[in-house]
């Protein structure tokens, strides 16, 4: 069966030894009692470690109480609190306990004192040259203003490079957009609609203020 010293019944660092009847505690200096639970130490002995503040105890069984500074605990402020065990750094950040504070080192794609900012969302994203940030699918992209491209809209782009004019139409870059000069028999902003021989076309009704063939803004 379990021995009388299992679980160490001796408090305050006392060492337990088995006796024929039960157990006996050998107490460290300043403690006494069956389980070394009574302290003979007072604040004059300076029992509080790590900058703990000692206050005289209110009852006879407790000659003093240590008020521990942040980061320490235990009856004598002898134990350092592992504040990093609470995993305060978000998104897999590395936690460093500096003593006076914590420091989070963030994984790639995250920032902030606790790594709480996702740089892959628009909150921390700057799109250059008038581009706007668009979120989606846990990532972001920049929707660039005309004439610019690339991840951050920093690169100059040719709006005609993607060959936007259908059916052999010729593309011209224009300050307000691109203009398609359509080949005979085609019409529309992108020359996408054939002109029928009877003069009618397959062109849907133009939106208000936009004539067929006008550059799209």
């Amino acid at each position: 069966g379990p021995g009388p010293c299992d679980g160490n019944p001796c408090a305050n660092g006392g060492s337990c030894s088995e006796t024929p009847r039960s157990f006996e505690c050998t107490c460290p200096r300043g403690f006494y009692g069956l389980r070394c639970e009574v302290s003979g130490v007072t604040c004059a002995d300076g029992p509080c470690f790590n900058g703990g503040l000692c206050v005289g105890g209110a009852d006879p069984d407790s000659a003093y109480i240590c008020h521990c500074p942040p980061g320490f605990q235990g009856s004598n402020c002898e134990k350092r609190v592992d504040r990093c065990s609470l995993q305060p750094c978000r998104n897999g950040g590395l936690c460093l306990d500096l003593g006076h504070a914590l420091r989070c080192r963030c994984r790639a794609g995250f920032a902030g004192p606790r790594c709480e900012h996702d740089l892959d969302d628009c909150a921390g994203r700057a799109c250059a040259n008038g581009g706007t940030c668009v979120e989606g699918g846990g990532a972001h992209r920049c929707s660039c203003a005309l004439g610019f491209g690339g991840r951050d809209c920093r690169e100059r782009a040719d709006p005609c490079a993607a060959r936007p004019c259908a059916h052999g139409g010729r593309c011209y870059a224009h300050f307000s957009g691109l203009v398609c000069a359509c080949a005979p028999g085609y019409m529309g902003a992108r020359c996408e609609f054939p002109v029928h021989p009877d003069g009618a076309s397959a062109l849907p009704a133009a939106p208000p203020g936009l004539r067929p063939g006008d550059p799209q803004r």
Epitope: P88, H100, A101, R103
Partner: antibody
Framework: QEQLVESGGGLVQPGASLTLTCKAS????????MCWVRQAPGKGPEWIAC???????AYSASWAKGRFTVSKTSSTAVTLQVTGLTAADTATYFC??????????????????????WGPGTLVTVSS | DIVMTQTPASVEAAVGGTVTIKCQAS??????LAWYQQKPGQPPKLLMH???VLTSGVPSRFSGSGYGTEFTLTISDLECADAATYYC??????????????FGGGTEVVVK
């Protein structure tokens, strides 16, 4: 507006001691560390020491221990005391703020690891 | 303590051009890197922190990248006002329990 101003520099003799003062205005001193960084002529910045305003914890570069002491003297001022000055200590001494951030329910303040406000600096020249 | 190594020591580029400055840390610092701009007679000014997060008011012509030990500051569409010395900086925490800060040696940017 947020501002740091250093004072106390000047021409001093080798072996002398000096106390530099940094006064802050326009922001809450708490949840910040106030630091000292020096820059010798034509060289890069060199961190000396900081004091965390919330609990007075001070930390300094290993080379600065012993001769450089940082203290908080009021709710808006910190000092850097330098002893045993030599010609190698000739530099512009800057006061800089390193912000700390606190969150409700968090176990501690969080250090930022950078300096987001600097004073104009005070020049210390050590020469006989 | 950590050592921050910056290259090149000096770089020259024309107005409208692009310059790239590299910073290498002697150990893994994750994203814990800041960049500063310093002009003669002035204190350093924080440009960006967390390797790539721009400080408020800094134009988006400045961009930062990198992770671990290798970091880059890129200045595009160079302007005359960008002529300055640029420094990288990180913080360190050693096993002995000491916390502190280290700067790179600086890169002078000359704009033609």
């Amino acid at each position: 507006q947020e501002q740091l101003v250093e004072s106390g520099g000047g021409l001093v003799q080798p072996g002398a001691s000096l106390t530099l003062t940094c006064k802050a205005s326009g922001f809450d001193f708490t949840s910040n560390a106030m630091c000292w960084v020096r820059q010798a002529p034509g060289k890069g910045p060199e961190w000396i020491a900081c004091i965390y305003n919330d609990d007075g914890s001070a930390y300094s570069a290993s080379w600065a221990k012993g001769r450089f002491t940082v203290s908080k003297t009021s709710s808006t001022a910190v000092t850097l005391q330098v002893t045993g000055l030599t010609a190698a200590d000739t530099a512009t001494y800057f006061c800089a703020r390193s912000p700390y951030y606190t969150y409700g329910g968090a176990p501690s303040a969080y250090a930022s690891g950078y300096f987001n406000l600097w004073g104009p600096g005070t020049l210390v020249t050590v020469s006989s | 303590d950590i050592v921050m190594t910056q290259t090149p020591a000096s770089v020259e580029a024309a107005v409208g051009g692009t310059v790239t400055i590299k910073c290498q840390a002697s150990e893994n610092i994750y994203n814990s890197l800041a960049w500063y701009q310093q002009k003669p007679g002035q204190p350093p000014k924080l440009l960006m922190h967390d390797a790539s997060v721009l400080t408020s008011g800094v134009p988006s012509r400045f961009s930062g990248s990198g992770y671990g030990t290798e970091f880059t500051l890129t200045i595009s569409d160079l302007e005359c006002a960008d002529a300055a010395t640029y420094y990288c900086q990180s913080d360190y925490y050693s096993t002995g329990g000491s916390y502190g800060f280290a700067f790179g040696g600086g890169t002078e940017v000359v704009v033609k």
